[in-house]
């Protein structure tokens, strides 16, 4: 199953990065699982990751690090609290878990540049 | 207002065939599987099997394997149901269901009667 | 194929008192995402079934709280704390983990 993101995303001065996740048509998919994983070297490790079903579109992954909405076959992902250690390649991962057949998908990554902010000078 | 709407149904003879139909309105028709149901009179819920609206992929219950065949028109947001060489123990209520995880969605149902 | 065993076959309750049914299948019904698509559905005569709970123990959207369901594995329960008149009818239980999908024998809940 094709999965599209994104190539490269530049994080907020905040440290927050938004970027779509789009698989291929769901057909008859009701149930949905995303994960967002940080590919270092050969190493994946997962960030986050939701289910979210047809039935509640709206509002998934009611998480510390990572929020988002769903619609169709498009997630909206935002991840928060990123620091210039955490630039890399995140990778949208969907599976379709119900009802079956299952199917995987992983997409290429999105390139994740995060730029510390410059500290403020004091003021005299 | 997400509607399931049945029609078809009727009294027809032994060997014959029939094409029950199952009409959706008020949400997009290939993002849900369309499920069928039997009820034999005075009998229990038989699932028979269900298709894939947006693929056409049908799987059946092993019990409807054969003289049943589960078909779309996606232009008409119709779903079919067609029965040959019909046997009296066909006769039944018929219902269609909208699934996700679940079937909140359910046609009235259509009555098929096959007698001589 | 899952079988799904409902007993009792059929039960005569007061308004006002508790009503249990059982709902037994031949096989765990974990699907291999970890869920149990084990759902209920109330019949009245003439009618389409309506949806009572899903996921064994979730209440779909406008379902009275005097309805819950619980379970695992291969046991599960439909319980209504207090039965109303509006509750008489056929009770059936569905498996929706494992192909082919199949309903319960049906339970009749009948007021006295």
């Known amino acids: 199953m094709h999965v599209a993101q994104p190539a490269v995303v530049l994080a907020s001065s905040r440290g927050v990065a938004s970027f779509v996740c789009e698989y291929g048509s769901s057909g008859n998919a009701a149930e949905v699982r995303v994960t967002v994983l940080r590919q270092a070297g050969s190493q994946m490790t997962e960030v986050c990751a939701a289910t979210y079903t047809v039935e509640d579109e709206l509002a998934f992954l009611d998480d510390s690090t990572c929020t988002g909405t769903s619609s169709g076959n498009k997630v909206n992902l935002t991840i928060q609290g990123l620091r210039a250690m955490d630039t890399g390649l995140y990778i949208c991962k969907v599976e379709l878990m119900y009802p079956p057949p299952y199917y995987v998908g992983m997409g290429n990554g999105t390139q994740i540049y995060v730029i510390d902010p410059e500290p403020c000078p004091d003021s005299d | 207002e997400i509607q399931l709407v049945q029609s078809g149904g009727d009294l027809v003879k032994p060997g014959g065939s029939v094409r029950l139909s199952c009409k959706a309105s008020g949400y997009t028709f290939t993002n849900y599987g369309m499920n069928w149901v039997k009820q034999a009179p005075g009998k229990g819920l038989q699932w028979m099997g269900w298709i894939n609206t947006y693929t056409g992929e049908p799987t059946y219950a092993d019990d409807f394997k054969g003289r049943f065949t589960f078909s779309l028109d996606n232009a008409k947001n119709t779903a079919y149901l067609q029965i040959n060489s019909l046997r009296a123990e066909d006769t039944a209520v018929y219902f269609c269901?909208?699934?996700?995880?679940?079937?909140?969605?359910w046609g009235q149902g259509t009555t098929l009667t096959v007698s001589s | 194929d899952v079988l799904m065993t409902q007993t009792p076959l059929s039960l005569s309750v007061s308004p006002g008192e508790p009503a249990s049914i059982s709902c037994r299948s031949s096989?765990?019904?974990?699907?291999?995402?970890?869920?149990?698509?084990l759902e209920w559905y109330l019949q009245k005569p003439g009618q389409s079934p309506k949806l009572l709970i899903y996921?064994?123990?979730n209440r779909f959207s406008g379902v009275p709280d005097r309805f819950s369901g619980s379970g695992s594995g291969t046991d599960f329960t439909l319980r209504i704390s207090r039965v109303e008149a509006d509750d008489a009818g056929v009770y059936y239980c569905?498996?929706?983990?494992?192909?082919?999908?199949?309903f319960g024998g049906g339970t009749k809940l009948e007021l006295k």
């Open positions: 996921k064994v123990s």
């Open positions: 269901a909208r699934r996700s995880i679940y079937y909140p969605y």
């Open positions: 096989q765990s019904i974990v699907y291999s995402n970890g869920n149990t698509y």
């Open positions: 569905f498996q929706g983990s494992h192909v082919p999908w199949t």
